[in-house]
Interface confidence: low
């Protein structure tokens, strides 16, 4: 992710006796929560690898960059960061690797400047549809988020709710159309089998979409047509077999796009002909000379760019009387 890093040193460590500060009282200007490090010059608070079980109540009002990584937060309740006065400057919030399994509706409310949120490496079995929108209104107030990092948030199989994980994540992304301003979305390493067709159409401002290291088999029902600002599309390390004409045309029509397709099990049969022709002509695919066939066996490791139409055949379908088991 590209979450900002602190540019200043001079971090002050907190004294343990400050841990019980009340969130309703304005924190002292130089106060730093227990188990955290603070730099007012860098507007940064780091509470990293401290096994915290809840968000500190006494965060300093100056904080712009908050790192709460490597903790044991388990649940983010509604208003987890609501303070008096509000954390009006908080722009970047990193909660990665903090054992979150539930993020409730309105967890990020009252953070008017929150631009970058990283929830990666948390086993999110229960992500409320209103985690980012804050309300169940059909159209919510726009979220200030422009960068949302959700890499590796898939919970273990036995902890998943009895519903589609893809559907749960997409519901949170689309609720109330609050994330219309989202520019970067990272969803890598989430075992996604498919991409719900609505998700991209309702995130028209995306510049960067990372879907790498999932299990996507096809993009047939996914439309990229309206993503005119899209600059990078990461589809490496999925289960893609072929890209069909409709998808190829849509990608080619995006004015600034770069597509990354490495390490997919491309099936080099007659259905691949259009994609091979397109690859030879297009400049949008980065590292296209590295793409190789995985199937059928006779084509394994052949470079897609080196194939011609004679190489791409489909075995004839035998009449039933000649088929064998």
């Amino acid at each position: 992710s590209s979450s900002p890093t602190s540019s200043a040193s001079s971090f002050s460590s907190s004294a343990p006796f400050l841990a019980s500060a009340v969130s309703a009282q304005p924190p002292l200007p130089d106060q730093c929560p227990a188990l955290c490090e603070c730099s007012e010059a860098a507007r940064t608070v780091k509470c990293v690898n401290r096994n915290l079980t809840e968000v500190p109540t006494d965060l300093p009002a100056y904080v712009r960059n908050l790192f709460l990584t490597g903790n044991q937060l388990a649940v983010l309740p509604a208003g987890a960061f609501a303070r008096r006065p509000p954390l009006a400057e908080l722009a970047a919030l990193n909660l990665s690797g903090s054992r979150l399994d539930e993020v409730r509706a309105g967890a990020f409310e009252h953070l008017p400047s929150l631009r970058q949120l990283d929830l990666s490496h948390n086993p999110l079995a229960d992500l409320s549809p209103f985690a980012f929108s804050g309300s169940n209104a059909s159209v919510s107030a726009p979220s200030p988020l422009v960068e949302l990092i959700l890499n590796h948030i898939v919970p273990p199989e036995d902890e998943r709710q009895n519903r589609s994980f893809e559907g749960m994540v997409v519901a949170a992304l689309l609720a109330g159309r609050a994330l219309q301003g989202l520019r970067r979305l990272e969803l890598a390493s989430n075992h996604f089998l498919y991409l719900p067709r609505d998700v991209l159409a309702q995130l028209p401002s995306l510049r960067h979409l990372d879907l790498s290291n999932n299990s996507l088999v096809s993009l047939t029902y996914v439309s990229f047509r309206n993503l005119t600002h899209l600059e990078s599309l990461h589809l490496e390390d999925n289960a893609l077999k072929v890209l069909h004409n409709g998808t190829l045309a849509e990608l080619q029509g995006l004015p600034h796009i770069r597509v990354f397709l490495d390490n997919n099990p491309w099936v080099c049969d007659c259905h691949m002909a259009d994609m091979v022709t397109w690859l030879k002509e297009t400049e949008v695919v980065q590292g296209k000379d590295r793409l190789t066939c995985a199937y059928p066996e006779k084509m394994r490791n052949r470079v897609l760019l080196e194939l011609n139409s004679a190489d791409l055949d489909c075995d004839p379908i035998l009449p039933p009387s000649l088929q064998t088991s």
Epitope: S2, R115, R183
Partner: antibody
Amino acid sequence: DVQLQESGPGLVKPSQSLSLTCSVTGYSITSGYYWNWIRQFPGNKLEWMGYINSDGSNNYNPSLKNRISITRDTSKNQFFLKLNSVTTEDTATYYCAREEYDYWFAYWGQGTLVTVSA
Amino acid sequence: DIVMTQSQKFMSTSVGDRVSVTCKASQNVGTNVAWYQQKPGQSPKALIYSASNRYSGVPDRFTGSGFGTDFTLTISNVQSEDLTEYFCQQYNSYPYTFGGGTNLEIK
């Protein structure tokens, strides 16, 4: 805080190339965001020229596409503007600016005046 | 290219007044508009983004509004330091384009 500082020759001869440097402190240009060049002509009209992003990719104003190049030196945390075949019409104050993920320019350099004259 | 038109090159106002600077886009740009203030000899400074969001540290007397093609920057209770030039910018599509600027002057 993020700071940007332009530098380069203040006088360039017609038909030559204009080269400017933007030095960034307080944030690594490879960590994120978009690093732009914008110029302001006498009379104060502003023109967006193009950017290089944190991945090293470019996007240029089509009106300049055949003449412009924006590159970077990540080891020095600098990015560069090169504008070829300049004419007197390229006389302007040149700014470098950081573009946020949602496209507007939050941080600007102080600007450097470049005059194109024989 | 999208043309951003600030029809009034100069506007007169007085300290304490309320003034509205307008900007018109040649086509629909949604809310993808920013406003900048530029004082003589300085670089532009961001005031408003996404048509109505105030940038951090900008006084709340500055407000932005508008959608589609018509946008307004309103300064209530004008201060002497506000008497300078203001630019709008669209970022709905490339190339990004700016308005020609509006100078606020003392009446």
